[in-house]
Amino acid sequence: QLTTESMPFNVAEGKEVLLLVHNLPQQLFGYSWYKGERVDGNRQIVGYAIGTQQATPGPANSGRETIYPNASLLIQNVTQNDTGFYTLQVIKSDLVNEEATGQFHVYPELPKPSISSNNSNPVEDKDAVAFTCEPETQDTTYLWWINNQSLPVSPRLQLSNGNRTLTLLSVTRNDTGPYECEIQNPVSANRSDPVTLNVTYGPDTPTISPSDTYYRPGANLSLSCYAASNPPAQYSWLINGTFQQSTQELFIPNITVNNSGSYTCHANNSVTGCNRTTVKTIIVTELSPVVAKPQIKASKTTVTGDKDSVNLTCSTNDTGISIRWFFKNQSLPSSERMKLSQGNTTLSINPVKREDAGTYWCEVFNPISKNQSDPIMLNVNYNALPQENGLSPG
């Protein structure tokens, strides 16, 4: 059976296509090619007479067609108007004609696309943004990329207009991109330049650093405030409710106890109209802001119950501190047998009983800091009960 095949089937505009003919019968007078799905003299492209080896152009001939002795038809410099069906009619020497129809599709070489946006400065959690991939072309597939990744599945991302439009519902600061669109057809593909979103957000709750609360007199107080915000936040400081200055950093040299108080950082975003504040307490004191870890020692760690006594000592080099004792997470002393002395430095147990066995530790603290020792284990033994002498009471 007579058939035709387009090589290639999908043709780039400006290129060429060859309509190949298979199973061409023997004993032919000639053949004609027509544009369309049927033989129509008004749409004849070319005819070829085998006897004279002469090609005759038809009404639909554009000058870009070449017919070959094997009936194949070459069309050069194709346009999108060339897309469609082509019919070959073979005039056989028995006067019975055969026909075969083929087709091809011409696609344009796609241009570099661009992205247009209906809002390039959206506000976080408030605005939606619609990106549109330009230009609009027929028979084109539109693809989107965010951060060089294909679109994630998200209820906030919507595709419409044949995937040509990407809508971000309720943008967040993480939606900055970059965004790229890609257009594809069967013969070409092209990707846009990246586009980034300037998402307006914040300010978030400010953070004051450093995190220190306690300072010694004579030190320099340098506080910095930061709140995530776009555009960057405008900052101001208040001390104990009184405005101080409009800067991101607050510096007070050579502080005194009088500089203790509430330090408030105020962050403002003039675009979103939002404000956030954070309050930090600063304490200026001679006390050590950091208490060293105390050492705990025992006069003996294994004692005989109801007989021995034991002294536990908590040692520290810090001054202006207090000491407290703990046994099995309970504060001491817990019985009349336990006594504290030398400013709670020593814990004495006399006599030791079975219930005193276990873990002990001490904690040193001042108004601004505390630290606790490693635990120490006290073991309580009992001697075997004395044998009865067998004498009857007297």
């Epitope: 007078f29 000639g30 003299g41 004849q44 085998i50 009404p59 005039i91 006067l95 004609n97």
Partner: antibody, heavy 121, light 111 residues
Framework: EVQLLESGGGLVQPGGSLRLSCAAS????????MSWVRQAPGKGLEWVSV????????YYADSVKGRLTISRDNSKNTLYLQMNSLRAEDTAVYYC??????????????WGQGTLVTVSS | QSVLTQPPSASGTPGQRVTISCSGS????????VSWYQQLPGTAPKLLIY???RRPSGVPDRFSGSKSGTSASLAISGLRSEDEADYYC???????????FGGGTKLTVLG
Amino acid sequence: EVQLLESGGGLVQPGGSLRLSCAASGFTFSNYAMSWVRQAPGKGLEWVSVISHGGGSIYYADSVKGRLTISRDNSKNTLYLQMNSLRAEDTAVYYCARDPTKGYAPTFDYWGQGTLVTVSS
Amino acid sequence: QSVLTQPPSASGTPGQRVTISCSGSSSNIGNNYVSWYQQLPGTAPKLLIYADSRRPSGVPDRFSGSKSGTSASLAISGLRSEDEADYYCGAWDASYNGYVFGGGTKLTVLG
């Protein structure tokens, strides 16, 4: 069944005009080249003109060039011959004939019954 | 004066084989296909042979065509009385850009 039926012949004075028609049926008219062939009384056959299946290619015998015009209306399955400036030597039976080869191996496989054109004063 | 030359007449008896010649040039018979037509008295011509030697369906195989160089021949074997008619050869002529016929041969079946 293939049928070709000519009409429009008759008596006309020299210099006059006549339009012949050939109604085709029984085949796809638009797929075939068509010709007019004439035969003067008692004489042989003389080819007059041919028109391709789409009407894009037309040829005439030297003896009629400029006076006779061939045309076709594929929507009406009809072939025409417009005859102007008629002469006595145009007197003949005019046949329309079908070429099944689209002109690649010109031949006439079906003929009409003919219509007589007489040019006389 | 016809471009293709045929004998004005030919004859034969029933059952006989008769040949009618057609002579032309390289611009017609030499490079193009030849057809033969039969015209019975008072009727339109009928195609007998096309493409030099091919018979359309319905034409008896008593009719055959051949070609050599710039000449063509129609042979009728087993001649019958109903074969009495005028016979024309025809071909496309590249120099005229038109179809040309021979002057016709009148075949008479004797007896």
